[in-house]
Structures are given as C-alpha cells and as structure tokens.
C-alpha cells in the first residue's frame, strides 16, 4: 500500500511539476523591467523565451515575437533547448508512468515490468527537473550579469544635459515558477525511483519457504535482490507472499484523489 501511495504521489507531484515547466516555458515574464529607479513608470517592459512585451499605463499591451533564430543570444537558445528537453522527457516520463501505476491494470503485465517502467519514468522526471532548473538558472545568471553591466553605465548623455535611462531587467515570475516546477518534477522522480524498490514482489525479502520439486527440494532463503537490479530480474519464479497467499481480488487499488489521472 505504501509503495502504491509513493508511486501515485510521485506521479502527481511530477505531473504538477511538468505542467509548471510547460507554463514557465510559455510565460512572457522571464525578465521584467527593474522599477527601482522609476517605480511609477508608464511603460513596463517584460520578456520571455519567445517574445518581448510592453504594457502601457493605458492598459494596452503589445507583444513581439523573436522572429529570428540566428540573431538571438546563444544563452537564450540554450535555455530554450533545456526547457524543451525537460518538457519532452517529462511528457515521455508521464506516459511511461501511467502504464507503470500499480493501481492501473493493463492485461497481464508483470509487477517487475511495472517496476522497470517506474524506474525509467523516475529517471526521466529527475533529468526533466534538472533540465528545467538548469535552464532557469542559466537565464537568471544571464540576467544578473546584464543587470550589473547596465548599472555600470546606467546614465549616458551629453554633458549631463540629456539623460538616457537604460532599461534594466530583473527576475520575472517565470523564473520562480520554473525553479519550483523543476524541483517538484525532481522530487516526483525520486519518489518514483523509491517506489520502484518495493514494486516487484520477487525482489523483496521473504521468510524461508520450501518448494518441493520432484526428486529434490529447493529452498528460497531470505536476502532478496537489490532494488538497483530491477532490470532483467527472474520473472519465472512463482510469487510466494509472506503471511499466506492472497487472492487476486484482495490485491486491489483503493479509490483516491489521484484516480482522475
């Protein structure tokens, strides 16, 4: 039951995380105009990975897409790539984890196969989360660098008569959404990997049970396989549960808040 809960919770946490990564990637507020020097600006600038926007005091908002690929900074391209890789891996991980869920039965899928799929999706979630965190962090670092560079030459002009205030940008909401979402996806992935350890019954420690074959006896001793050997485990062994055999009806999934997924 604990394994099912851990797996289900890991799936939901990852699902929320990946939804957050997608949201962050699509958001326009990756960087927002720093209002320190002009808190009552009538024109507010903010930028995303795909377009830059200007919101006027009048309420009018205009957004322009970055219609060039080669003209964009390499760092921005790298951030885009990291976020897309994170989304793709996360989406594949979600697809795999749906079939891996203990509460969902697909034909006569072995528990060991589900364990393998759970581990695979868990690793995908971890990598997805790391990609998102890396992408957001690279962008944040780029912002910090540019912020101090623009602060160094904040005012330029002719003899101080005419001032041209350079627009500085600071962290936008998307960065925080990305960090939290990446962290959630990472946590979800770790939970899936933990759930994998207890999924396959033949990979658990059982008490000594005798199996009488014709001619000689074979005894299965305690000291099960390590969880890390989830791939390629012996699936031909009969499943022997401690505390007596359990009927198929007794091994059931209980309705929970995660059943809508």
């Amino acid at each position: 039951m604990a394994v099912t809960a851990c797996q289900g919770l890991g799936f939901v946490v990852s699902l929320i995380g990946i939804a957050g990564i997608i949201a962050a990637t699509c958001m326009d507020q990756w960087s927002t105009q720093d209002l320190y020097n002009n808190p009552v600006t009538a024109v507010f600038n903010y930028q995303g990975l795909w377009r830059s926007c200007v919101r006027e005091s009048s309420g009018f908002t205009e957004c322009r897409g970055y219609f060039t690929l080669l003209g964009l900074p390499a760092m921005l391209q790298a951030v885009r790539a990291l976020m897309i890789v994170g989304i793709v891996l996360g989406a594949i991980g979600l697809l795999v984890s749906i079939f891996a869920l203990k509460c969902i039965r697909i034909g006569s899928m072995e528990d060991s196969a589900k364990a393998n799929m759970t581990l695979t999706s868990g690793i995908m979630f971890i990598v997805s989360g790391l990609c998102a965190i890396a992408g957001v962090s690279v962008f944040a670092n780029m912002l910090v660098t540019n912020f101090w560079m623009s602060t160094a030459n904040m005012y330029t002009g002719m003899g101080g008569m005419v001032q041209t205030v350079q627009t500085r940008y600071t962290f936008g909401a998307a960065l925080f959404v990305g960090w939290v979402a990446g962290g959630l996806t990472l946590i979800g992935g770790v939970m899936m990997c933990i759930a994998c350890r207890g999924l396959a019954p033949e990979e658990t420690n059982y008490k000594a049970v005798s199996y009488h074959a014709s001619g000689h006896s074979v005894a299965y001793k305690p000291g099960g396989f390590k969880a890390s050997t989830g791939f390629g485990s012996n699936t031909k062994n009969k499943k022997i549960y401690d505390g007596g055999a359990r009927t198929e009806d007794e091994v059931q999934s209980y309705p929970s808040k995660h059943d809508y997924v």
């Epitope: 009538a42 005091s57 309420g59």
Partner: antibody, heavy 118, light 113 residues
Framework: EVQLLESGGGLVQPGGSLRLSCAAS????????MSWVRQAPGKGLEWVAT????????YYADSVKGRFTISRDNSKNTLYLQMNSLRAEDTAVYYC???????????WGQGTLVTVSS | DIVMTQSPDSLAVSLGERATINCKSS????????????LTWYQQKPGQPPKLLIY???TRESGVPDRFSGSGSGTDFTLTISSLQAEDVAVYYC?????????FGQGTKLEIK
C-alpha cells in the same frame, strides 16, 4: 459615440473641498485607464492624476499629491476627483480624459471650471 | 520629472505653407522594449478641449488629416503641417507619455501670416 461629461465645478474658498465627477458613455468604461488634466485660465495643460483599469493603480502630480484623490465607480461608469485643501493655484478648467495606445489621451470632456477664491 | 520644451512659443505661417513645431525632452522618451517614442501631440482650438493628433511620436490618430505628421526620436521631436489650412489655427502641445508625472510642453501658438 464616446462621451465624457464633467460636473461638480464651481466657486470654493481656499482650504475648501470639491468633488468632480465625470460620466462616461459610449465605451466599456471599466477597460480604460482614465485621467484628469487641468488648464489654468490663459495657461497651458497640466496633468493632474491617472487611475488605471482593473486593480485601479493611481498616480498623481506632485502639486496635488496628498490633497486630491482620483477614484472610479465602474458600475456607474463614473470617474471622480476629490479635491481637498484647495488653493488659489488650483483654479482651472478640469478635463476628464481617456487613455489609449501610447498612453495618449484620445477623448476629452468639455471641462468643468473650478474657481478657488475668497 | 521630464521637462518638455517647445519652440517657438508662437509661429505665423502663410496659408498653404509648411509649419514646423519642435519639442525637446530632458530625458529620452524612446522605450527600448518596443523601440517606440512615447511622445504625443495635441491641438487645442480656442474654447475647445485639446484634440489628439499624433501618438508614439509619429502615429497619426484616426480622422486626423494626413497633412499632419510627427517625427523624431529620443529627445528631439517635430510636428509638421505640410500645407497650412485656416482651420489649423490653434495652440499645439507635446506631451511626455513615457513616465509619470506626464508633462506637457508650454504650447506653441500657430497663426496665419
């Protein structure tokens, strides 16, 4: 047709109070940022205050900050300017305006005259 | 605050001739986000409220005759009336729409010579 109609102007003594109203029609009032602009007799234009649509952020000219309050009632399609501690230099025609692209004021009312005198 | 300075204070031009009004701001009105200049031109005829002519320094408001044009960037702007008509007699104001407080120029009175 967009219409802005100011009212509430008149003669008031220094230190007194007055509340100007601007009835808007012909457009979705709640969607627009609105402003008050004044013009002293024979002088130029002076921006007084602005109130944004939605969450209603307010901005004021230094000369009226702390004395004037801009507000709006979207259910009544009305813009207000509460003027307290009035001074002789506040004597002017007060215009109600609507903001558009570029923060430009595309529609202006006919104005209401406020005279501060003892 | 951004100070707006118009020149000349008054201008007399013959009918059909070109009229040019200048406006200078103490700070740049160019927004780097959209490369637009937040400067607006208004026309005020005697006894009437001002009328919007041009916003974003060069975008003509709908219904404004095409003889009116705006140009300039950063801190220096110009309103041009290519062929002066009798109905163009008015006071013209430029305005900073870039940052609060919004500030107007002192106005330029345009008359017929």
């Amino acid at each position: 047709e967009v219409q802005l109609l100011e009212s509430g102007g008149g003669l008031v003594q220094p230190g007194g109070s007055l509340r100007l109203s601007c009835a808007a029609s012909g457009f979705t009032f709640s969607s627009y940022t609105m402003s008050w602009v004044r013009q002293a007799p024979g002088k130029g234009l002076e921006w007084v205050a602005t109130i944004s649509s939605g969450v209603s952020y307010t901005y004021y000219a230094d000369s009226v900050k702390g004395r004037f309050t801009i507000s709006r009632d979207n259910s009544k399609n009305t813009l207000y300017l509460q003027m307290n501690s009035l001074r002789a230099e506040d004597t002017a025609v007060y215009y109600c305006t609507r903001l558009t692209k570029g923060n430009a004021m595309d529609y202006w009312g006919q104005g209401t005259l406020v005279t501060v005198s003892s | 605050d951004i100070v707006m300075t118009q020149s000349p204070d008054s201008l007399a031009v013959s009918l059909g001739e070109r009229a040019t009004i200048n406006c200078k701001s103490s700070q740049s009105l160019l927004n780097s986000g959209n490369q637009k200049n937040y400067l607006t031109w208004y026309q005020q005829k005697p006894g009437q409220p001002p009328k919007l002519l041009i916003y974003w320094a060069s975008t003509r408001e709908s219904g404004v005759p095409d003889r009116f044009s705006g140009s300039g960037s950063g801190t220096d702007f110009t309103l041009t009336i290519s062929s002066l008509q009798a109905e163009d007699v008015a006071v013209y104001y430029c305005q900073n729409d870039y940052s609060y407080p919004f500030t107007f120029g002192q106005g330029t009175k345009l008359e017929i010579k």
